[in-house]
C-alpha cells in the first residue's frame, strides 16, 4: 500500500493514463489500475501502469485520458446468456440464484446482529467510562462539552439511542436542563456516524471500492460536523431548538402512544441475545451519579426476577430524616419511619454464552468486540462477493439506473426529497440509523449507488432514527412524557435544520465534496482513514473534554488560535484558488510551507516505516483478516495467500512507461481476469438473470 | 405467655431513693423495650421513660431527668428502675409495660408497685 | 411535648349504646396514637394501636379511627365489662403522652 510514484519531471497536466480493452466501455480504475491524484501541495504528476506480465503485448502510446474516479465501475457480465442455457442450465442458473439470495440475506443477517453486538460490545468496554462522562457538572454551563460529551459517549456506546436515553433521563430527573441537553444530542449524532465509518474500514483492500465506500460513509459525519458548527453557535445564541420544541410540546396535550414497533431487532434479537444480554440501566445509574452502579456489572445475569413492593419500619437518627412528618414515630427509645422498600427476588437466569463465566466487563467487552468486528469483517467481505456476482450486466443496469436516475424534467429536484424519505422510511424499519447507513456503504463501495444518491438517503437516515425517538418518547411514561418528547424534537428539529443548510441548493453540499476529498486522500494513504476516525471521534472531542475541565479560560487560550489558524489557512486556499493574484507570489502556493505541513507523503514514510515491522507477519492469515491487517500495515510483498494483498502486489509491480494494451483480448472476460478483476475459475460458471 | 411481675410496694421519705423491679418472662427479653409509666392517685398516666434491654439503651422525659436511671439485667430478665430524690408528688403507682416491637404502644402491663412517700 | 386532650372526661351509658370517645392532639401525630382500658386498681389494658388496629384478644365491638390530629374510640355495643376508665396515648414523638382519661360509667 505504498503511495503511488510521483515523478518529478512529469507533465504540468495531472492527467491520468489507463490501460483499457477491446470492447470495454471506460471504467472506473479498479483494484489493479487505479490512479490517484497526489496532494494538491504537490507537483502535479502523471500516473502509468503496466500490463500484468502474462499479457501479449503492450504498446507504447499516446496516454488516454480516464474517467473520473467517482463514476461508478460497469459491473461486466461475463455469464452466458439465459437464452444461450439449455434446461439443466436455466434449472441449475435459477436454483444458484436461489442460493445466492439466501446466502446474501443470511450473510446480512449475521451483518446486522454483528452491530448489534458490537454495540454491546463498545458498552460493555466503554459504557461506565460513558456513564461517567455524564456525571460531569460542567455540562450545564459548557455547550461544547455537551457536544464532546455526546460524541464520546456515543462512539463509546455506538448507540445514540443508549445515550439520547440517558440524556432523557437525567433530564427527567432535573439533572440536566433541556438547554444543556440539545449540545450532547448534536453530539450524538455526530458519534452515530462512527460505525457505517468503520464498516467502510473493512473494504480496505480495493482501492477504487474503498474510495467509494470512505467517502460514502463519511459524508455522513460531514454532515453531521459541518450542521453542528453552524447551528451549535445558533442554537447557544438564540435558544431556537428549545423554544420551537417547547412550544410544540406545549401547544400538544400529548396521551401516552404506543411503543416505536421493533421490526428488525424482532429478527435479530433471537440471535443476539443468544451470544450476551446487557443491563443497559446501569450506564444511566452511573450517569446519575449511583454509586452503587459503579461496582454493577453490564452483563446481565438473571432475566427472570420477582419484584415486590413493601413497606417497612426503619429506624432513623432524627424526626428531621422521617419520611414525612405523619410518617414518623417513637418506640420510646428510637424514631421509627416507614420507608418504601423494593425486595428483588431472582428467579431465572438469563440464557447467553457469558453468563456463568463471571468475566469483568472488560474482558467479555475485548472478547465480543473482536468476534464481532471478525464477523462483521467476513459478512461485509461476502454480501460485497455475492452481490459482485449478482449485479451484472442488465441487473446491474436496471439497479443502478433505478437507484441512480433522477426523475424527468422539470421534476429532477424531486428524486433527491424522494430518497431521503426512502431513507427515513427504511431507518424507521430497521430502527437504527447505523444499520441502514452501515448496510448503505457497501452498496457505495461496489458501485451500485453513487455518492450523489446516498448522500439523500443518509440525511435521510438521520431523519428517519428520530422519529422513532418520537414515537418511544410518546411511549414513555407521564412524568418523562415532556423532556423525552422535547428531546427526540430537537433532534428532529436539529436534522431538519441540518438539511435546510446542506441539501436544497446543490452549491451547498459540501458534505460530498469533503467526503470526496476525503476519499481521494484515504485511498493513496489507507492508514489516513484510520488516522482521520481517531482524530475526529477520540482525539478532538477529548481534547476539547479535557481543555473544558481545565475551565473556559484555558479552552478559550487554546481554542480561539486554533480556530483563527483553521479560518486563515481556509481563506488563503480559497484565495489561492479563485484569486491567487490578490496574494503575494510567496502566498500563491504552498511551498513556502515545509513539506510535512502541506503533504502527506513524509507521513507516509513514517507510517510505513512505522508498520514495516509488521509487515512480515501481518498478511499471511484468512481472507476475512487480510482487509483488517492491509488498512493497518501498507504491506504489498506479505502475503501471497490473500487475494487484497496479490492485488497489491500486482498493482505496486511496474510503473515507468505509459502503456496502452493492444485490443488483441478474445474476449471482455479474460481481460477482466487479466486485470485481476474476476477469479478465472468464475467465468463459466457465472449465470445472468435476466 | 408473656408475664410481667413487679416488686411490692414500698414506703420512703422524701430525698430518699427507690428502685422497683420488673421480672418478665414469656417472651425475648431483649427485643423489646420495657417502659415505665406511673399513676398518681385519682390521676391519669405519665410516662417515665423506657429502656431497650438488648443494649441497654434509655430515653426519659425530661421531668424526670437526673432523678431516674433505668437497668435491665438479661441474665434474670428483670428490668429496674430507680428514682432518686423522693417527693411526696411522687406517691403513685409504678407500672412496667412491655413496648411493641418497632412502636411506642405497650402491649402488656405488670401489675403495679405503689410507692408511698412520706415524713 | 404534644398534648392529648379527651372529651367527655365523663360519659355515662347503657349496656347496648353505642359509645364514641375522641382524642384531640396539640399537634400531628399521623397515626401513631394508642388507646387503653384501665379498670379500678389494675394496671392498663391495650385496645387499639396505630389508631385503627386492634390488639389480640379484642373484641370487634371496640373499634378505632381518625389520623393527625382527631382520633375515635368506638364501642358499637356496650357491654357490662366495658364500664371503666379509657386512655388515649401518642407515640409520634417523646415523651410519650397520654390523655387525661375518659370515665365511662353505667347510666
Known amino acids: 500500500m505504498a503511495p503511488w510514484p510521483e515523478l518529478g519531471d512529469a507533465q504540468p497536466n495531472p492527467d491520468k493514463y489507463l490501460e483499457g480493452a477491446a470492447g470495454q466501455q471506460p471504467t472506473a480504475p479498479d483494484k489493479s489500475k487505479e490512479t490517484n491524484k497526489t496532494d494538491n501541495t504537490e507537483a502535479p504528476v502523471t500516473k502509468i501502469e503496466l500490463l500484468p506480465s502474462y499479457s501479449t503485448a503492450t504498446l507504447i502510446d499516446e496516454p488516454t485520458e480516464v474517467d473520473d474516479p467517482w463514476n461508478l465501475p460497469t459491473l461486466q457480465d461475463s455469464g452466458i446468456k439465459w437464452s444461450e442455457r439449455d434446461t439443466k442450465g436455466k434449472i441449475l442458473c435459477f436454483f444458484q440464484g436461489i442460493g445466492r439470495l439466501i446466502l446474501l440475506l443470511g450473510f446480512l443477517y449475521f451483518f446486522v446482529c454483528s452491530l448489534d453486538i458490537l454495540s454491546s460490545a463498545f458498552q460493555l468496554v466503554g459504557g461506565k467510562m460513558a456513564g461517567q462522562f455524564f456525571s460531569n457538572s460542567s455540562i450545564m454551563s459548557n455547550p461544547l462539552l455537551g457536544l464532546v460529551i455526546g460524541v464520546l459517549v456515543t462512539v463509546l456506546v455506538q448507540s445514540s439511542s443508549t445515550s439520547t436515553s440517558i440524556v432523557v433521563s437525567m433530564v427527567s430527573s432535573s439533572l440536566l436542563t433541556v438547554r444543556a441537553a440539545i449540545p450532547i444530542i448534536m453530539g450524538a449524532n455526530i458519534g452515530t456516524s462512527i460505525t457505517n465509518t468503520i464498516v467502510a474500514l473493512m473494504q480496505v483492500g480495493d482501492r477504487s471500492e474503498f474510495r467509494r465506500a470512505f467517502a460514502g460513509a463519511t459524508v455522513h459525519d460531514f454532515f453531521n460536523w459541518l450542521s453542528v458548527l453552524v447551528l451549535l453557535p445558533v442554537e447557544v445564541a438564540t435558544h431556537y431548538l428549545e423554544i420551537i420544541t417547547q412550544l410544540i410540546v406545549e401547544s400538544f396535550h400529548f396521551k401516552n402512544g404506543e411503543d416505536a414497533p421493533d421490526l428488525l431487532k424482532v429478527i435479530t434479537k433471537p440471535f443476539t441475545k443468544l451470544i450476551v444480554q446487557l443491563d443497559k440501566k446501569v450506564i444511566s445509574q452511573i450517569a446519575m451519579n449511583d454509586e452503587k452502579a459503579k461496582n454493577k456489572s453490564l452483563v446481565k445475569i438473571w432475566c427472570k426476577t420477582f419484584t415486590n413492593k413493601t413497606q417497612i419500619n426503619v429506624t432513623v437518627p432524627s424526626t428531621a430524616n422521617c419520611t414525612s412528618p405523619s410518617l414518623c414515630w417513637t418506640d420510646g427509645i428510637q424514631n421509627w419511619t416507614m420507608k418504601n422498600v423494593t425486595y428483588k427476588e431472582n428467579i431465572a437466569k438469563c440464557q447467553h454464552i457469558f453468563v456463568n463465566f463471571h468475566l469483568p466487563d472488560l474482558a467479555v467487552g475485548t472478547i465480543l468486540l473482536i468476534l464481532s468486528l471478525l464477523v462483521l469483517c467476513g459478512c461485509l467481505i461476502m454480501i460485497v462477493k455475492i452481490l459482485g456476482s449478482v449485479l451484472k450486466g442488465q441487473v446491474a443496469t436496471v439497479i443502478k439506473k433505478t437507484i441512480n436516475t433522477d426523475f424527468p424534467f422539470p421534476f429532477a429536484w424531486l428524486t433527491g426529497y424522494l430518497a431521503i424519505l426512502v431513507g427515513a422510511g427504511m431507518t424507521f424499519i430497521v430502527q437504527s440509523s447505523s444499520v441502514f447507513t452501515s448496510a448503505l456503504t457497501p452498496l457505495i463501495g461496489i458501485g451500485v449507488i453513487t455518492i450523489e444518491r446516498a448522500y439523500p438517503l443518509t440525511l435521510g437516515s438521520n431523519i428517519g432514527t428520530t422519529t422513532t425517538a418520537i414515537l418511544a418518547a410518546l411511549a414513555s411514561p407521564g412524568n418523562a412524557l415532556r423532556s423525552s418528547l422535547q428531546i427526540a424534537l430537537c433532534h428532529f428539529f436539529f436534522n431538519i435544520s441540518g438539511i435546510l443548510l446542506w441539501y436544497p441548493i446543490p452549491f451547498t453540499r459540501l458534505p460530498i465534496r469533503m467526503a470526496k476529498g476525503l476519499g481521494n486522500i484515504s485511498a493513496k494513504y489507507r492508514w489516513f482513514a484510520v488516522f482521520y476516525l481517531i482524530i475526529f471521534f477520540f482525539l478532538i472531542p477529548l481534547t476539547v473534554f479535557g481543555l473544558s475541565l481545565a475551565g473556559w479560560r484555558v479552552l478559550v487560550g487554546v481554542g480561539v488560535p486554533v480556530v483563527f489558524i483553521i479560518i486563515l489557512v481556509l481563506c488563503l486556499r480559497l484565495l489561492q484558488s479563485r484569486c491567487p493574484r490578490v496574494l503575494p507570489k510567496k502566498l500563491q502556493n504552498w511551498n513556502f510551507l515545509p513539506l510535512w505541513m502541506r503533504s502527506l507523503k513524509p507521513w507516509d514514510a513514517v507510517v510505513s516505516k512505522f508498520t514495516g515491522c509488521f509487515q512480515m507477519r501481518c498478511c499471511c492469515c484468512c481472507r476475512v483478516c487480510c482487509r483488517a491487517c492491509c488498512l493497518l500495515c501498507d504491506c504489498p510483498k506479505c502475503c501471497r495467500c490473500s487475494k487484497c494483498c496479490e492485488d497489491l502486489e500486482e498493482a505496486q509491480e511496474g510503473q515507468d512507461v505509459p502503456v496502452k494494451a493492444p485490443e488483441t483480448f478474445d474476449n471482455i472476460t479474460i481481460s477482466r481476469e487479466a486485470q485481476g478483476e474476476v477469479p478465472a475459475s468464475d467465468s463459466k460458471t457465472e449465470c445472468t438473470a435476466l | 405467655q408473656v408475664q410481667l411481675v413487679q416488686s411490692g410496694a414500698e414506703v420512703k421519705k422524701p430525698g430518699a431513693s427507690v428502685k422497683v423491679s420488673c421480672k418478665t418472662s414469656?417472651?425475648?427479653?431483649?427485643?423489646?423495650?420495657m417502659h415505665w409509666v406511673r399513676q398518681a392517685p385519682g390521676q391519669g398516666l405519665e410516662w417515665i421513660g423506657a429502656?431497650?434491654?438488648?443494649?441497654?439503651?434509655?430515653a426519659y422525659n425530661q421531668k424526670f431527668k437526673g432523678r431516674v436511671t433505668m437497668t435491665a439485667d438479661t441474665s434474670t430478665s428483670t428490668v429496674y428502675m430507680e428514682l432518686s430524690s423522693l417527693r411526696s408528688e411522687d406517691t403513685a403507682v409504678y407500672y412496667c409495660?412491655?413496648?411493641?416491637?418497632?412502636?411506642?404502644?405497650?402491649?402488656?402491663w405488670g401489675q403495679g408497685t405503689l410507692v408511698t412517700v412520706s415524713s | 411535648d404534644i398534648q392529648l386532650t379527651q372529651s367527655p372526661s365523663f360519659l355515662s351509658a347503657s349496656v347496648g349504646d353505642r359509645v364514641t370517645i375522641t382524642c384531640k392532639a396539640s399537634?400531628?401525630?399521623?397515626?401513631?396514637v394508642a388507646w387503653y382500658q384501665q379498670k379500678p386498681g389494675k394496671a392498663p389494658k391495650l385496645l387499639i394501636y396505630?389508631?385503627?388496629t386492634r390488639h389480640s384478644g379484642v373484641p370487634s365491638r371496640f373499634s378505632g379511627s381518625g389520623s393527625g390530629t382527631e382520633f375515635t374510640l368506638t364501642i358499637s355495643s356496650l357491654q357490662p365489662e366495658d364500664f371503666a376508665t379509657y386512655y388515649c396515648?401518642?407515640?409520634?414523638?417523646?415523651?410519650?403522652?397520654f390523655g387525661q382519661g375518659t370515665k365511662l360509667e353505667i347510666k
Open positions: 409495660a412491655r413496648g411493641m416491637y418497632g412502636h411506642g404502644a405497650m402491649d402488656y
Open positions: 414469656g417472651y425475648t427479653f431483649t427485643t423489646n423495650n
Open positions: 429502656i431497650y434491654p438488648g443494649s441497654g439503651a434509655t
Open positions: 399537634q400531628d401525630v399521623g397515626t401513631a
Open positions: 396505630w389508631a385503627t
Open positions: 396515648q401518642q407515640y409520634s414523638s417523646n415523651p410519650l403522652t
